[in-house]
Amino acid sequence: SGTTNTVAAYNLTWKSTNFKTILEWEPKPVNQVYTVQISTKSGDWKSKCFYTTDTECDLTDEIVKDVNQTYLARVFSYPAGNVESTGSAGEPLYENSPEFTPYLETNLGQPTIQSFEQVGTKVNVTVEDERTLVRRNNTFLSLRDVFGKDLIYTLYYWKSSSSGKKTAKTNTNEFLIDVDKGENYCFSVQAVIPSRTVNRKSTDSPVECMGQEKGEFRE
């Protein structure tokens, strides 16, 4: 059913990392265009990506208004060149997305080790606090600003000369670990939100090692 020669969107999928959020769908349009609407549970639908031939729509600006809300999007299909046409139910053909709660579901982006500094047998490792597109008082918030203590980092570290890994955890962006004097260590970090049921962990950061070109002091 629906408008002649118009097919409903399908495989509506949220792609979201550090709150940068894009809705993707199929199929690639043939003689049709799409418009996306997004709403919280309030049912106040807002239209985005009007009459597009793309099969994705950046909804970041909408979801960052309140990352704790649950959102639903719907993709309307219209015949190209006749966007006033409606389906048999008196409205354009559309399909709904799965629900999406940014705070609970956005993927954690790959973290970056900002710096490490050795003082004696202690090494301070600092994780870069990545900026998100979530705003408060006209300022972009960092990942830590948004998640607070819900976000922890796990540090994996090992002697360059061996493969045995140790771990440490922090609910700040800094680690202070004990190391053996005279040994070089390699580090990798992972962002984790333990309270989550999905998308709990980021991918591991690139490995950084002491005594390499980048040095032990980096801003």
Partner: antibody, heavy 118, light 106 residues
Framework: EVQLLESGGGLVQPGGSLRLSCAAS????????MGWVRQAPGKGLEWVST????????YYADSVKGRFTISRDNSKNTLYLQMNSLRAEDTAVYYC???????????WGKGTTVTVSS | DIQMTQSPSTLSASVGDRVTITCRAS??????LAWYQQKPGKAPKLLIY???SLESGVPSRFSGSGSGTEFTLTISSLQPDDFATYYC????????FGGGTKVEIK
């Protein structure tokens, strides 16, 4: 606890008017679409109207379009249904319901009875 | 408008029975279907939304399935508290309810 309490029902003559109210508590009222559903005596459920959280979007069943007006006052956590030009077939129990996205009803009030009769 | 047809209209069953109620839509509604339970003199209660998602607090003996035009509500083992009338509701295009299925004691 999420609660909805309807009021304003009663006996009214054909052609008359009535305003139903629904007082909401236990949730952030403006965060949800709300709706009215009715049930005639011994009959099934019939959707009447839905309003978005801001009040900016309203939807009506064909059977009440032009006669009924849904509205809300978010400062008072209250939903309304203004019913004009009432007919005998509008006789029913009217339920207020919380309606995420305006799609399905996850919390219902106990209902208020409207009887249209001369 | 999308019409919703429930069958059977009345179903006689005993405690412990497995009960299945069917709801058919006049056109495809994808998975945009809810199921409600209503007891005499009481308000309806949401059981299932999005065809198969169990509402919080609803016993796991209730389950929903289907997509497109054909849907089922299943009660795996009927309990005394389950004798009631059940309604399906589509929300693909506005809102329409099925006519109801009364589950009564055999």
């Amino acid at each position: 606890e999420v609660q909805l309490l309807e009021s304003g029902g009663g006996l009214v003559q054909p052609g008359g008017s009535l305003r139903l109210s629904c007082a909401a508590s236990g949730f952030t009222f403006s965060d949800y679409a709300m709706g009215w559903v009715r049930q005639a005596p011994g009959k099934g459920l019939e959707w009447v109207s839905t309003i978005s959280g801001s009040g900016g979007l309203t939807y009506y069943a064909d059977s009440v379009k032009g006669r009924f007006t849904i509205s809300r006052d978010n400062s008072k956590n209250t939903l309304y249904l203004q019913m004009n030009s009432l007919r005998a077939e509008d006789t029913a129990v009217y339920y207020c319901a919380k309606a995420p996205y305006g799609y399905y009803m996850d919390v219902w009030g106990k209902g208020t009875t409207v009887t249209v009769s001369s | 408008d999308i019409q919703m047809t429930q069958s059977p209209s009345t179903l006689s069953a005993s405690v412990g029975d497995r009960v299945t109620i069917t709801c058919r839509a006049s056109q495809s509604i994808s998975s945009w279907l809810a199921w409600y339970q209503q007891k005499p003199g009481k308000a309806p209660k949401l059981l299932i939304y999005k065809a198969s998602s169990l509402e919080s607090g609803v016993p796991s003996r209730f389950s929903g399935s289907g997509s497109g035009t054909e849907f089922t509500l299943t009660i795996s083992s009927l309990q005394p508290d389950d004798f009631a009338t059940y309604y399906c509701q589509q929300y693909k295009s506005y809102i329409t309810f099925g006519g109801g299925t009364k589950v009564e004691i055999k």
